[in-house]
Amino acid sequence: RAPRCRELPAQKWWHTGALYRIGDLQAFQGHGSGNLAGLKGRLDYLSSLKVKGLVLGPLHKNQKDDVAQTDLLQIDPNFGSKEDFDNLLQSAKKKSIRVILDLTPNYRGENLWFSTQVDSVATKVKDALEFWLQAGVDGFQVRDIENLKDASSFLAEWENITKGFSEDRLLIAGTNSSDLQQIVSLLESNKDLLLTSSYLSDSSFTGEHTKSLVTQYLNATGNRWCSWSLSQAGLLTSFLPAQLLRLYQLMLFTLPGTPVFSYGDEIGLKAAALPGQPVEAPVMLWDESSFPDIPGAVSANMTVKGQSEDPGSLLSLFRQLSDQRSKERSLLHGDFHTFSSGPGLFSYIRHWDQNERFLVVLNFGDVGLSAGLQASDLPASASLPTKADLVLSTQPGREEGSPLELERLKLEPHEGLLLRFPYVA
């Protein structure tokens, strides 16, 4: 008799793939044309990334540091109208992309929470949650919650409103904190909150340190669903050396939880890489004409168009990973086990019941290393085979689908490998 299948866990939509943050509509769409109507035309691109949710905005009216002139129910006319927003929601729904609205109140000001008038702002947020839930949004994001007095109790209240409307709605909170205790205390009072933080960016970016950061986080947060990013709003390039971008994409997509990216992460967009650009929100490089001010400033390999045509690009890697993440049970909700490997490496397995299993080996170092996989650390349910098939490498030159002998596995500097192998009873 075949062994009984393990019961599938309840899967919410945000468990099934990545979230994509567009914090600045105008920068995302390029010079002079950033509105909701224009964003509708970019939904096909988001579909091609296979992201499951779009974290949008803030879009509401906010006069810098002026509570009275901040209206969380009104869309700033610069971004479009309520009708434009409704149309966007409808179009996104047709493409199975959920829309999460950022309601961080004073997004144009110094203190995002108007520190002196927290209570009146909190009331505004409460009203806004009700209003936008009725309008059809799939969830909310609030950032900089470390600057919100009594954050835990406000978040609990807002989560109740969100979940009270539907269990299928999501609340995301963002913090600049990288302190695990602070993060855990914010999570403890909110069972379904997704929290983005700077936790992973407070790193020496070595295999050993990253492994300990990830395992400590997972141990501290127990069996709750978590999210993975390097910050609450910034680009990966702001926190990572360029040579680790591919490695981190592979890691963020294969850790247990929801990967959260900012627009441009998929092409390695840099903050203020080009003259005159704002650091916070660099212009998305759709093609070579995206930055007309300085001819020749943008080369094809920096752009969506150029990278779409190159199977070895960062964008192609992102699409491949996003595809795997959204369809493979072991990556969707599989168990996670790390194990010992060579110095400078971080290696782990994702497995679910009798489904295909995945092995991730990440070389954070700038030297070539033997993987030195030591499966003795693994439970019997997650043992390693002698060979595994290469799904992808973050570096060019390896043949996808080729079987690799795990005992003789070597990694190039900064190389990450995603390998698959079947369940064997």
């Epitope: 110095p343 700038d366 060019p396």
Partner: antibody
């Protein structure tokens, strides 16, 4: 068996460039890295740079502007190029294999002598 | 760069004696990345001990290595005439790789 063999010009005039070829046998350059190390007469060893199996290169920053390492996997050859040589570049130049075990050089060539003199 | 200082610069020992030479790093090195080479006069260096304490193929068991952090050592439990050579330590803790200046061992 595993072998590396350096071949170079022997004598180079000051300010000229140097090219040394390391020809390997018994292993593939698609699976191993190759380092370059030099040793001035009567002195210690100085690391110059490395080319990994995938083709990525790293150099000693003190010499970076003058150095370049490349390879031809099909010919099993690694090439070291060094520009603007001075008399203190006189040394025995070695290539050595890295087997990805922890950044050590497990097999060395016999070396080639380079003398910089007019 | 991580500078390796070897001591003594040279030493002399009689056959059968125990010999220890040290290698000190200016900043910490992972034990996985500290190695020793033997070079005899007129020959190229040979890998002798890798990752602090593992003997390379063909190296006699009288050799051993130990250490951690910034301090490492190579020991010969009972020196023999064929051990006369210069011994170099080498580390990796980020580029560049560096070598110590060597310890020259003479046999009386």
């Amino acid at each position: 068996q595993v072998q590396l063999k350096e071949s170079g010009p022997g004598l180079v005039a000051p300010s000229q460039s140097l090219s040394i070829t390391c020809t390997v046998s018994g292993f593939s350059l698609t699976s191993y890295g190759v380092h370059w190390v030099r040793q001035p007469p009567g002195k210690g060893l100085e690391w110059l740079g490395v080319i990994w199996a995938g083709g990525s290169t790293y150099y000693n920053s003190a010499l970076m502007s003058r150095l370049s390492i490349s390879k031809d996997n099909a010919k099993s050859q690694v090439l070291l190029k060094m520009s603007s040589l001075q008399t203190d570049d006189t040394a025995m130049y070695y290539c050595a294999r890295d087997n990805y075990g922890g950044v050590y050089l497990d097999v060395w060539g016999a070396g080639t002598t380079v003398t910089v003199s007019s | 760069e991580n500078v390796l200082t070897q001591s003594p610069a040279s030493m002399s020992a009689s056959p059968g004696e125990k010999v220890t030479m040290t290698c000190r790093a200016s900043s910490s090195v992972s034990s996985s990345y500290l190695h020793w080479y033997q070079q005899k006069s007129g020959a190229s260096p040979k890998l002798w001990i890798y990752s602090t304490s593992n003997l390379a193929s063909g190296v006699p068991a009288r050799f051993s290595g130990s250490g951690s952090g910034t301090s490492y050592s190579l020991t010969i439990s009972s020196v023999e005439a064929e051990d006369a050579a210069t011994y170099y330590c080498q580390q990796y803790s980020g580029y560049p790789l560096t070598f110590g200046s060597g310890t020259k061992l003479e046999i009386k």
